[in-house]
């Protein structure tokens, strides 16, 4: 799996999980968020030739169509595959909020 | 939705789905599949700007932090969302087999 | 990489008030929070507030109400922290300490505030 | 706010010995919880974040786990060198209180 167990234990230019911390405040603009100031969300990058952890048949197509015909824009792009949700701290006027944002953190990639 | 009736009569930079017909032998060097001789497979290309058919609340994250940061390379791309079968005739000796190749034709795109 | 210095050691009346401050390099300063930590004598520690040089954001122990007052300048990249009406209680070394990632991960190497009449 | 009850108050082992330290919330702080290593007349030093990460340069017998309102502190192979007051901390809505130390 092209999760942080492989990933961030090997240099890596194919489709892989990248580290990528986000600051609410600072990256996104958001002020409203209390806790926490920031997260691990993660992101995905990097080349998908062709059978790297292909999604499905058309992706498995396109990166031997793209092997075949480098010179095409068709290719397939290195995307997140397992999500997790992040436990938020949030306040309306004095009283505080606790919300799970769904999707929120990337645990593993795929090529799609 | 990012789709054939919306992409392919709209000139449109960003996320969008792209014709793109295979021809079996040419482009993927098959040779096994008698007919089709070839197929409207298409593919998801363009940019994937803030809210722009985000998929999850991280492709959310992910493109107004880049809206933010625009130097970074934490983006997410543009990919297939809505994929159909494609129905295939091929020989096993002199015996046809017909078959379904699921997922080989994108029919809209998303960006993740 | 990241550097916290802060100011010497003060001497202080009870009832009087200290300024301290904490220069930050190697990072930017405007998009991180900066936490104020104290610990006392052979005791832990207690957490005092935050300020966001960004905007001036803060958030405060409501222990400290009226007396803690967290400032950042962001022309030289220094926060201060001022405590008023100070007592034998508040000695103690005072720390700045940049928060990142659910934690602090750098440290000012402390200040030590001595109260005595 | 939130109170961090950490445990034992202080423990004696030998080189190569596993140690335990425990922190408990007094409500659920989720992952949000911080270690720190001080040596006397030392700066802390920060060891585990958000509850199981590894600080840059903190060597790997130290790890952190737990989630919730029960976290723990593990040094897996003891040495000299870890002799020191270590504190729990959480980072879940302000005041961030810290354990008494172990």
């Known amino acids: 799996a092209l999760d942080a167990a492989y990933c961030f234990r090997n240099v890596q230019d194919n489709c892989c999980l990248r580290p990528l911390y986000i600051d609410f405040k600072r990256d996104l603009g958001w002020k409203w968020i209390h806790e926490p100031k920031g997260y691990n969300a993660n992101f995905c990058a990097g080349a998908c030739p062709y059978l790297w952890s292909s999604d499905t048949q058309h992706s498995r197509v396109l990166s031997l169509y793209n092997t075949i015909n480098p010179e095409a824009s068709a290719s397939p792009c290195c995307v997140s595959q397992d999500l997790e949700p992040l436990t938020i701290l949030y306040y309306i006027g004095k009283t505080p909020k606790i919300e799970q944002l769904s999707n929120m953190i990337v645990k593993s990639c795929k090529c799609s | 939705a990012l789709d054939a009736a919306y992409c392919f009569r709209n000139v449109q930079d960003n996320c969008c789905l792209r014709p793109l017909y295979i021809d079996f032998k040419r482009d993927l060097g098959w040779k096994w599949i008698h007919e089709p001789k070839g197929y409207n497979a298409n593919f998801c290309a363009g940019a994937c700007p803030y809210l722009w058919s985000s998929d999850t609340q991280h492709s959310r994250v992910l493109s107004l932090y880049n809206t933010i940061n625009p130097e970074a390379s934490a983006s997410p791309c543009c990919v297939s969302q809505d994929l159909e079968p494609l129905t295939i005739l091929y020989y096993i000796g002199k015996t046809p087999k017909i078959e379904q190749l699921s997922n080989m034709i994108v029919k809209s795109c998303k960006c993740s | 990489q990241v550097l916290l210095v802060q100011s010497g050691a003060e001497v202080r009346k009870p009832e009087a008030s200290v300024k301290i401050f904490c220069k930050a390099s190697g990072y930017s300063f405007t998009s991180s929070w900066m936490n104020w930590v104290r610990q006392a004598p052979a005791q832990g520690f207690e957490w005092m507030g935050q300020?966001?040089?960004?905007?001036?954001?803060?958030n405060y122990n409501g222990k400290f109400k009226g007396r803690l007052t967290l400032t950042a300048d962001t022309s030289t990249n220094t926060a201060y922290m001022e405590l008023s009406s100070l007592r034998s209680t508040d000695m103690a070394v005072y720390y700045c300490?940049?928060?990142?990632?659910?934690?602090?991960?750098?440290w000012g190497q402390g200040a030590l505030v001595t109260v005595s009449s | 706010e939130i109170q961090m009850t950490q445990s034992p108050s202080s423990l004696s082992a030998s080189p190569g010995d596993r140690v335990t330290i425990t922190c408990r919330a007094s409500e659920n702080i989720y992952s949000n919880l911080a270690w720190y290593q001080q040596k006397p007349g030392k700066v802390p030093k920060l060891l585990i974040y958000a509850a199981t990460n590894l600080a840059d340069g903190v060597p790997s017998r130290f790890s952190g786990s737990g989630s919730g309102t029960d976290f723990t502190l593990t040094i897996s192979s003891l040495e000299p060198e870890d002799a020191a007051t270590y504190y729990c901390?959480?980072?879940?809505?302000?005041?961030?209180?810290f354990g008494g130390g172990t």
């Open positions: 300020i966001y040089p960004g905007d001036g954001d803060t």
């Open positions: 901390q959480h980072f879940w809505g302000t005041p961030y209180t």
């Open positions: 300490a940049r928060h990142y990632d659910g934690s602090t991960d750098y």
